[in-house]
């Protein structure tokens, strides 16, 4: 991305805070550096170079320092061919751009939040679905296997399409898709528990192509710390989804005196939110933030896509380690409530449960800690990275091992508490999920760097269906086949249920601590990486000139 | 064939205890949903309570009539339901049906496909 | 609490009058309604579920419809077995509760 930003900086198309930076810089008569492109060197008036794309950035959130990428500096390069036709200085784009990009990103993470609180109201009133259709719990494992198998496997069909077609189109029809299926789904009668499954599966596919698609947007829209901060208002809605869905279910239920209202809620703010991503959201062209100044070529197949991603380490590693966030979640989510459940038993300030919901309290103050650690590892990870990226160019994957071998330790440290302090317990799963919590938006960003614009969907989707696939999909399960097993060489006692469940869980952070590791592979091959698709992106940039209108 | 058979009726005092069995027969008792029913002489039918099965935790629901008076319980090796009941009064004199729910593996219905012959219990001083 | 209410209480027919029993819902129950009916000195036995399903082995002649609040149980041509109660349930809340009963009588 060398030439190329210089050339959509001169074309007057670069981002508001980059053309900030530049005439900050020109100001202090700021010569281009030794990664900098030679055809942005010498042009303009008095000779003044323009600060390279790989040099310290000023942004909105911070600067950020480039990565020199290393690559010879080709003169007849497209972007510096347009470079040299450019104004001296560059344009900034109008304020109301800035603030419609403002609102397009507001408005995607809105919908991320409706996902998210639309798949969790389900789990806020899941007793009340388990009660009313008679469900047993192998048939509420069928639903939640129902909506990870179809959201695993429509997510690499959403990223080829996401990859090719009209984005926000997809996207507000995966809205308008979801929203008609889980308002439909609250008519179901009482004997079709078949079609509650169904419309799960149906809810899955919905959520699948706005989770795939809608952080590609974001990647197109902002670039370096700006993305970074943008993303991570994008997965702030994680949390927020999830601690207003449980509001939701319960709270709409309680008022309207049946759980069937709880699911007509977030339909009918999915349809506004629809709406609003067709009229509000731009229709950005794949790179736009990362080369202004060109359009990319015509795509590639989705064979070749999948032989780039495999073959793309850092790709590979921070997929794996996403893979283990998801695994430790999906497993802590399902199991630590009953756990502390457990303890309180043995610690005796609790009695022996016979009559589910067992550790209904605890269900509540887990979930309340988990939303709130979702608020502040975004915040923490986001502002650590910034913080870093001063430091490392590979501040990005060193974060977030940092935060997973940390999470490990905490992890670990629940069962020891657990046997004493129930307290202490919730303090280590409060900074365990803080930790874990804290690569969320950074994960998604290495991606936006080292996967280039016309991939991004795809990469994102696979990366989805891996995280998945060898994370929550099966944890919670293998967990409990774990305990059971446990258990059954053991004698029948209290002691026992909490200590085989306690034994199962301690493979978390087993699974973290490798989880880590696989982000300080990442770290290992970061830089390469990035520098590729930055120079893949060059090679895929055709000259505004000679783009057919 | 499907078989449900009640035992362990009788005349009994108020604030007395007694214990109802259901022996049953011809379906897959450990998968399915067990609930009683009586009627009281000359009166409609009134739902007592249910028991689940193993995959639904053996989880309980009373009528309140009855809740924190009767206690449902099962024992699926002996293919067996039972009704625990403390602190009879007068009005709980009925017959007490042992009944099956329909069961479709991932869920279970709410409504009795099977009965018992029923069992007497009177309740009187 | 959901309550049914049955009417009538009592119906008198003749063999081979086709009629009509109704069950009305205190709130919408959608379709979750099963009819039992109740011989004499018998134990119940399942006719219809969920408003309109026939269960197997129960005669053609008895069919059910309605949704949300009112059932409706049809007994066409009415035999000289069929003079028993019948009482409708709800499935929708727990707890599960029955109609009063109707008594179909000859006339």
């Known amino acids: 991305m060398m030439c190329l930003e210089c050339a959509s900086a001169a074309a007057g198309g670069a981002e508001e805070e980059e053309a900030d930076a530049e005439r900050r810089r020109r100001r202090r008569g700021a010569q281009p550096g030794a990664g900098g492109s030679a055809c942005c060197g010498a042009r303009g008036v008095g000779g003044a170079g323009v600060v390279s794309a790989d040099e310290e950035v000023q942004t909105l959130s911070g600067s950020v320092r480039r990565v020199p990428s290393g690559l010879p500096s080709i003169p007849s390069t497209p972007g510096c061919a347009a470079a040299a036709k450019g104004p001296s200085a560059p344009q900034p784009k109008p304020a109301s751009l800035g603030r419609g990009r403002g609102a397009a990103a507001a408005i995607l993470s809105l919908g991320n939040v409706l996902n998210y609180l639309d798949r969790y109201t389900v789990a806020g009133v899941l007793l009340d679905i388990q009660q009313h259709f008679g469900v047993k719990d192998r048939g509420a494992g069928l639903l939640q296997s129902v909506f990870i198998c179809s959201f695993m496997v429509a997510a690499p069909i959403f990223g080829y399409l996401g990859d090719r077609f009209n984005r926000k189109v997809i996207l507000s029809c995966g809205i308008f898709f979801w929203s008609a299926v889980t308002f439909s789904s609250s008519f179901i009668p009482q004997q079709y528990f078949w079609l509650l499954v169904l419309s799960r599966g149906l809810v899955g596919i919905g959520e699948a192509s706005y989770s795939t698609i809608a952080p590609t947007i974001i990647g197109d829209l902002f670039t370096k710390n700006t993305r970074t901060l943008m993303l991570s208002v994008f997965y702030f809605a994680i949390p927020l989804g999830s601690g207003l869905g449980y509001i939701t279910g319960s709270s709409v239920k309680q008022a309207a005196g049946d759980w069937h209202w709880a699911l007509r809620v977030s339909p009918v703010l999915g349809m506004i939110t629809g709406t609003l991503i067709l009229i509000l959201v731009p229709a950005t062209k794949r790179g736009h933030a990362d080369q202004l100044g060109g359009q990319l070529k015509a795509r590639t197949s989705w064979l070749r896509d999948m032989k780039a991603l495999i073959r793309n380490r850092s790709y590979v590693f921070s997929s794996l380690a996403t893979s283990a966030v998801s695994f430790a979640t999906g497993a802590l989510g399902m199991w630590i409530p009953l756990y502390l459940h457990r303890a309180q038993v043995v610690q005796k300030t609790a009695e022996t449960c016979n009559s589910p919901p067992c550790g209904a309290k605890d269900s509540l103050i887990f979930g309340a800690i988990t939303c709130f650690t979702g608020f502040l590892g975004v915040v923490t990870g986001a502002g650590a990275t910034r913080w870093c990226r001063l430091r490392t160019q590979r501040a990005d994957p060193l974060v977030c091992a940092v935060g997973m071998l940390g999470s490990a330790i905490f992890i670990c440290l629940i069962f020891v508490a657990a046997k004493t302090s129930i307290v202490g317990a919730y303090i280590c799963i409060f900074v365990g999920e803080t930790l874990l919590f804290s690569n969320w938006a950074i994960t998604a960003d290495i991606l936006m760097y080292v996967v280039i614009p016309t991939r991004r969907a795809t990469a994102v989707a696979l990366q989805s269906f891996t995280s998945h696939l060898l994370g929550d999909a099966g944890s919670p399960y293998l967990i409990g086949f774990i305990s059971d097993l446990i258990r059954q060489s053991t004698k029948d006692s209290p002691l026992w249920e909490f200590l085989s469940l306690g034994y199962a869980l301690m493979l978390c952070p087993f699974v973290v601590v490798l989880g880590g590791m696989f982000f300080l592979a990442t770290a290992l091959f970061f830089l390469s990486d990035r520098a590729k698709a930055e120079q893949q992106v060059n090679q895929l940039v055709m000259p505004p000139a000679s783009v057919k209108v | 064939e499907v078989q449900l058979v009640e035992t362990g009726g009788g005349l009994v005092q108020p604030g007395s205890s007694l214990k109802l069995s259901c022996s049953t027969s011809?379906?897959?008792?450990?998968?399915?949903?067990m609930s009683w029913v009586r009627q009281a002489p000359g009166k409609g039918l009134e739902w007592v309570g249910l028991?689940?099965?193993?995959?639904?935790?053996?989880?309980?629901n009373y009528a309140e009539s009855v809740k924190g008076r009767f206690t449902i319980s099962r024992d699926d090796s002996k293919r067996r339901v039972y009704l625990q009941m403390y602190t009879l009064r007068d009005q709980d004199t009925a017959t007490y049906y042992c009944?099956?729910?329909?069961?479709?593996?991932?869920?279970?219905?709410?409504?009795?496909?099977?009965w018992g012959q029923g069992v007497m219990v009177t309740v009187s001083s | 609490d959901i309550v049914l209410t049955q009417s009538p209480a009592t119906l008198s027919v003749t063999p081979g009058e086709s009629v009509s029993l109704s069950c009305r819902a205190s709130q919408g129950i959608s379709t979750s309604i099963h009819w039992y009916q109740q011989k004499s000195n018998e134990s119940p036995r399942l006719l219809i579920k969920y408003a309109s399903q026939s269960m197997s082995g129960i005669p053609s002649r008895f069919s059910g419809s309605g949704s949300g609040t009112d059932f409706t149980l049809r007994i066409n041509r009415v035999e000289s077995e069929d003079f028993s109660v019948y009482y409708c349930q709800q499935s929708y809340n727990l707890p599960l509760t029955f109609g009063s009963g109707t008594k179909l009588e000859i006339k």
């Open positions: 028991i689940k099965d193993k995959n639904s935790n053996y989880e309980a």
């Open positions: 009944t099956s729910h329909e069961d479709f593996y991932y869920y279970s219905s709410y409504y009795f496909d099977y």
């Open positions: 011809g379906f897959t008792f450990s998968e399915t949903w």
